[in-house]
Interface confidence: low
Amino acid sequence: QLSLPSILPNENEKVVQLNSSFSLRCFGESEVSWQYPMSEEESSDVEIRNEENNSGLFVTVLEVSSASAAHTGLYTCYYNHTQTEENELEGRHIYIYVPDPDVAFVPLGMTDYLVIVEDDDSAIIPCRTTDPETPVTLHNSEGVVPASYDSRQGFNGTFTVGPYICEATVKGKKFQTIPFNVYALKATSELDLEMEALKTVYKSGETIVVTCAVFNNEVVDLQWTYPGEVKGKGITMLEEIKVPSIKLVYTLTVPEATVKDSGDYECAARQATREVKEMKKVTISVHEKGFIEIKPTFSQLEAVNLHEVKHFVVEVRAYPPPRISWLKNNLTLIENLTEITTDVEKIQEIRYRSKLKLIRAKEEDSGHYTIVAQNEDAVKSYTFELLTQVPSSILDLVDDHHGSTGGQTVRCTAEGTPLPDIEWMICKDIKKCNNETSWTILANNVSNIITEIHSRDRSTVEGRVTFAKVEETIAVRCLAKNLLGAENREL
């Protein structure tokens, strides 16, 4: 926990001479910033700078080159990381007065003259003097109003609806504020704000529509912040619905949208009576033209086991909404003739999910499958090859005598997907061939024996072993194996 920053001069308040310069130094254990009375537009003569020092503390200096009445107010030094939108700043404060014989009251913005109260709540009429010694009275149509006054805040009390004027006398000269108007309103302690954007994705030329609704509050200041705001591009509307309860519906319409209108659309509602603020935001994207993106969740070569049930899922992002179709080997998939089904579901505004489902995979389901997504502006496709994996099986095992040479060839034909591998084994002692230990793998490096293998098509393979001379009776075994299984046959 950091201790509060400290301010030099170490005072709660300070009176500064008109047109003189003054500086406030803030020291903290972490990075510190200043909050001061003037808005950024007005603060051209307020300079904030960081300063080096040997103490190991962070030092930020606020310097005013020429003090005016407008510099009167509360200066707060706070740790950067503690600043939040909602809470009052936690930090160290000093109140500066800049007495000006020609400006009795600190200048205010027009909204400060509207004082809104709820029911019988107390309120502050914020006429603050530039000189703490100036006596001030509060008047309404009936005369002087008794209320407690604090030169840092103004008059505090329970006020009836109507206009109020603050009056002060400085060196025999009388000053009056313009009227502060006190209004009574219906308001809730929390702002109930709802934002609705039926669409968040558009293309050029379309009209963006965003609405914000405030419930159970009579007077709300609602500000829109959006990319086209500086150009005054949007049209704002307010609709007041009173039945069954108060509802203020603010609508922002941006016609003829362009890519530059992409960004955050924010409505910030503020209750007129208290510092209750609520914000809602939606991100709108405007595209030059429609688009389609296809994101498969599988690769371009996929395998499925015989009789297996398998789903292939493709994510599609598209605007405007796409038409999605599936092809097999470049022909439209006719689902009712196969145990293959496809479907499309909308996941989000521009997100779709299409599934290709194989119910019981068959060999003939192998092939090239293509998903095609198209809308008025774009066409995208994704093709993948599907292999139905079939365990290896031996179709044929035959031998072929070479006549007078005494040579002999054995042919083994096997099928399966992936294509099986073929291995040969021999057993030289026929009587013992029932015993597995009598079988030895035929090595390729034996000079008088030649083995070869070739594929006939995508799923059939033929292996051959040629014995140059067979001098005794032997047993030959063909072993065909792939990922899914192995089979052997002997002769």
Epitope: S33, E47, I48, R49, N50, E52, N53, N54, T60
Partner: antibody
């Protein structure tokens, strides 16, 4: 207009001390700002070495802290860098630069032309 | 120390091209990033401070953006005098560190 000019020997022997001076004209080094040394080995990027502020406080890059000293001569409006026990790795172009901190943010807005220092026997 | 990584390390482009250089910080540096331009045999020159603010006298074809850890320097339409090496520098955390530089060469 403020101007910075580095000076010092171009060749230093290994294990000796490198000494450079930056002369500032057009602005008093005691008025404001932090006055920095930045170096650039041949064909490489920039490395901040350290500074002396207008008030005389110093900050050094931790990687050089044990070997570095930055001092100033206010009468001549100069600040100097001393780097002891140098090796070939200290061969670089050495720049002096002013570090501004307006807007509550630090950047180097005025630079000297740089001086080349070679560490070799 | 905060590491600053620039990419690409070099780029070839022609006069009139739009060029973007990126700088990545090893930790969040908010908007405390400065861009410098350096020509051979010369000292670096300040271009952009606080991620997006153009220094006095710098042409408007230069612009900076980003916050947090990822930043970009964009030159909208390259001029002959823009061929140089560009460095980013963080001012978030001491010691101040620079990126390795991006050399912009004539194609």
């Amino acid at each position: 207009d403020v101007q910075l000019q580095e000076s010092g020997p171009g060749l230093v022997k290994p294990s000796q001390t490198l000494s450079l001076t930056c002369t500032v004209s057009g602005y008093s080094i005691t008025s404001d700002y932090a006055w920095n040394w930045i170096r650039q080995p041949p064909g490489k990027g920039l490395e901040w070495v350290g500074y002396i502020s207008y008030s005389g406080s110093t900050s050094y890059n931790p990687s050089l802290k044990s070997r570095i000293s930055i001092t100033r001569d206010t009468s001549k409006n100069q600040f100097s860098l001393k780097l002891s026990s140098v090796t070939a790795a200290d061969t670089a172009v050495y720049y002096c630069a002013r570090r501004d901190y307006r807007y509550g943010y630090w950047y180097f807005d005025v630079w000297g032309a740089g001086t080349t220092v070679t560490v070799s026997s | 120390d905060i590491q600053m990584n620039q990419s690409p390390s070099s780029v070839s482009a022609s006069v009139g091209d739009r060029v973007t250089i990126t700088c990545h910080a090893s930790q969040n540096i908010h908007v405390w990033l400065t861009w410098y331009q350096q020509k051979p045999g010369k000292a670096p020159k300040l271009l952009i401070y606080k991620a997006s603010n153009l220094h006095t006298g710098v042409p408007s074809r230069f612009s900076g953006s980003g916050s947090g850890t990822d930043f970009t320097l964009t030159i909208s339409s390259l001029q002959p005098e823009d061929f140089a090496t560009y460095y980013c520098q963080q001012g978030q955390s001491y010691p101040w560190t620079f990126g390795g530089g991006t050399k912009l060469e004539i194609k």
